[in-house]
């Protein structure tokens, strides 16, 4: 009995034409939604003039359907038992699952001003930039619609910059009609214990963003894992959103629509400072903002974002050190709402439910050459938005799963 099940599973989780895994892998049958909460700044003038704490008020959810497009350019390589593909990006607004429309306005940090002052630290360049910021009537903060903030707008200040810079700015610009990858993953034909594990990303085994082992591309993309998952395992996966590999550990047994699954969570240790967790030393890339690598809970991914000072954290700075959030008022971190988890069916290794939560922040520093940043007396890691990307196996699929997998085991 058990041997037969194992044999069937091993056959069906291989990523090749004709298997159950392959069909669902090419185009997920699960509806995936990405909810956004935008941090609306309540006191822009006080911050700019007096270097006050930034008072934010989250507004959301604004919901989009995502990852509904099938993988593209799927190519099997029998020589090394891999399959390569592109994951196309697409987002469709879901008004019925949102608190407002894409035309809703928000007061947010001026992305271009904050980024330009960081990318061009030369004092004379900053004098030049200052004249263009003033000429374009730009300020430290700006009012933008949801659509502009997420998917892009033409920035008036950047439109005047004589350097060859893109004048379009947006937290996820460009997104629609783009693709993530190329990913090359093991198809599991030679060894089922390697199925879905990433061999290369964009043609490389490393990211070139981090030093040492932090730069490695580890594990799968978290949509599935090799079968026969044990509770004692540390599940490694790579997330291009955060420009790094990370891991999840077992937390609890969960019953999902009659299917027994293991809930794996991203532990606080993964976000710890090198002082608390020496393994994280290579994720600390600079000494000043990180207070000599003692700060925790934020990840500087500027190297992955063309030098723009983007910092990734958990929503509301969950698991972050007090110094990170001391300049921001209005945050309420909550483990239940703001942590990331994966519900994995252990026999197949399939992720049947997940909630990926992350926050995108931008660093803004005082600049004595840029008028609108001149009065700042400290650095701010400014929360722009947080997102909750969720997917749950549909009722029909769950029924099929119960009958074909868990039912047979039990």
């Amino acid at each position: 009995g058990d041997m037969l099940i194992q044999k069937t599973i091993k056959k069906e989780v291989v990523l090749e034409e004709g298997t159950i895994a392959f069909k669902n892998w090419v185009k997920t049958g699960t509806e995936i939604y990405r909810q956004f909460w935008i941090f609306d700044v309540q006191n822009p003038q006080e911050v700019m003039m007096n270097s006050s704490n930034i008072q934010v008020k989250q507004r959301g959810p604004y919901t989009y359907r995502v990852r509904f497009l099938a993988k593209e350019n799927i190519t099997q390589d029998p020589k090394d038992n891999t399959v390569s593909f592109l994951q196309p990006n697409g987002a469709i607004f879901e008004p019925s699952l949102s608190v407002g429309t894409e035309a809703d306005n928000f007061t947010v940090l001026n992305l271009a001003v904050a980024a330009a002052s960081h990318i061009y630290p030369n004092p004379f360049v900053q004098v030049v930039l200052n004249s263009l910021i003033n000429k374009s009537k730009s300020s430290m903060f700006q009012v933008r619609t949801l659509r502009e903030l997420l998917w892009g707008y033409t920035d008036p200040f950047l439109s005047l910059v004589p350097y060859p810079v893109s004048t379009r700015v947006g937290m996820f610009y460009p997104y629609n009609n783009t693709a993530d990858g190329v990913y090359k993953v093991f198809n599991g034909k030679d060894s089922i214990s390697k199925v879905a594990i990433i061999d290369t990303y964009k043609g490389k085994r490393n990211l070139s963003y981090w030093e040492s082992y932090c730069d490695m591309i580890n594990g799968t993309d978290a949509a599935s894992f090799p079968p026969f998952v044990e509770k004692s395992q540390v599940l490694q996966f790579f997330s291009s959103d955060i420009c790094r590999s990370i891991y999840a550990v077992f937390e609890s047994d969960v019953n999902l629509k009659g299917i027994p699954v293991y809930r794996f969570v991203l532990p606080s240790k993964a976000f710890a400072s090198p002082v608390q967790n020496p393994d994280n030393h290579c994720f600390c890339t600079e000494k000043i903002i990180s207070k000599n690598c003692t700060s925790y809970g934020v990840l500087d991914i500027s190297k992955c974002k063309e030098g723009k000072p983007v910092y990734i954290s958990l929503p509301h700075f969950l698991y972050a050190s007090p110094d990170v959030s001391e300049t921001i008022d209005g945050l309420n971190p909550n483990e239940e709402e703001h942590r990331t988890y994966l519900d994995i069916e252990p026999i197949t290794g399939f992720t049947l439910q997940f909630a990926k939560r992350l926050q995108v922040n931008l660093l803004v520093k005082p600049s004595n050459k840029i008028q609108v940043l001149k009065r700042l007396k400290r650095n701010y890691i400014v929360p722009i938005l947080w997102l909750n990307e969720t997917g749950t196996i549909g009722d029909e699929k769950a029924k099929m799963f119960r009958s074909q997998v868990t039912g047979k085991i039990n």
Epitope: P123, V127, V128, S131, Y163, K369
Partner: antibody, heavy 121, light 107 residues
Framework: QVQLQQSGAELVMPGASVKMSCKAS????????MHWVKQRPGQGLEWIGA????????SYNQKFKGKATLTVDESSSTAYMQLSSLTSEDSAVYYC??????????????WGQGTLVTVSA | ETTVTQSPASLSMAIGEKVTIRCITS??????MNWYQQKPGEPPKLLIS???TLRPGVPSRFSSSGYGTDFVFTIDNMLSEDVADYYC?????????FGSGTKLEIK
């Protein structure tokens, strides 16, 4: 030590052009912008403009746009300024200057010795 | 463009006296004012940079103060070697602009 060596004095006809040089030594040339400053005899100083020596991006004082053209030659660590359609108003000493970036910025911390341009028929 | 008005145009002072030169700007430039000394036949020399910062190697008898639009440059005990032209420069915005200069002579 930082040195900016400028080319020698020029006597030029009205309507003609002149190109002067400023050779830098004692530092990495492409790490700093090069500024140019005009001083008419017995008069004050005027900022003409500056050039980013690493990518040749220029920033001009509007007053000198069309009059001055700034260029660089990275291989010889030399900055150039060409002045065109010369008139008697262009008779002056022209300086190249470089900043110093430390804990605070020192604008025009290093100067060349100046190039005297005399416009006369 | 920020206009810089420097006064006086010339100044005749006795050795050991206190010298005061003033620059007023047409716009608020915070503390982005610089002061230069120029002796005949030489390029200008930076004495004081933004934020009233005395440059290394410059004697402490030279100082400056001011913020916003009103700036003062001071020589506490004038020496004969201080005979020169003095210029202020605003570096807050482009184009950088100089004051018209002050000629300091010995009385």
């Amino acid at each position: 030590q930082v040195q900016l060596q400028q080319s020698g004095a020029e006597l030029v006809m009205p309507g003609a052009s002149v190109k002067m040089s400023c050779k830098a030594s004692g530092y990495t040339f492409t790490d700093y912008w090069m500024h140019w400053v005009k001083q008419r005899p017995g008069q004050g100083l005027e900022w003409i403009g500056a050039i980013d020596t690493s990518d040749s991006y220029t920033s001009y004082n509007q007053k000198f746009k069309g009059k001055a053209t700034l260029t660089v030659d990275e291989s010889s660590s030399t900055a150039y300024m060409q002045l065109s359609s010369l008139t008697s108003e262009d008779s002056a000493v022209y300086y190249c200057a470089r900043d110093y970036y430390g804990s605070s910025t020192a604008w025009f911390a290093y100067w060349g010795q100046g190039t005297l341009v005399t416009v006369s028929a | 463009e920020t206009t810089v008005t420097q006064s006086p145009a010339s100044l005749s002072m006795a050795i050991g006296e206190k010298v005061t030169i003033r620059c007023i700007t047409s716009t608020d430039i915070d503390d982005d004012m610089n002061w230069y000394q120029q002796k005949p036949g030489e390029p200008p020399k930076l004495l004081i940079s933004e934020g009233n910062t005395l440059r290394p190697g410059v004697p402490s008898r030279f100082s400056s103060s001011g913020y916003g639009t009103d700036f003062v440059f001071t020589i506490d005990n004038m020496l004969s070697e201080d005979v020169a032209d003095y210029y202020c420069l605003q570096s807050d915005n482009l184009p950088f602009t100089f004051g018209s200069g002050t000629k300091l002579e010995i009385k």
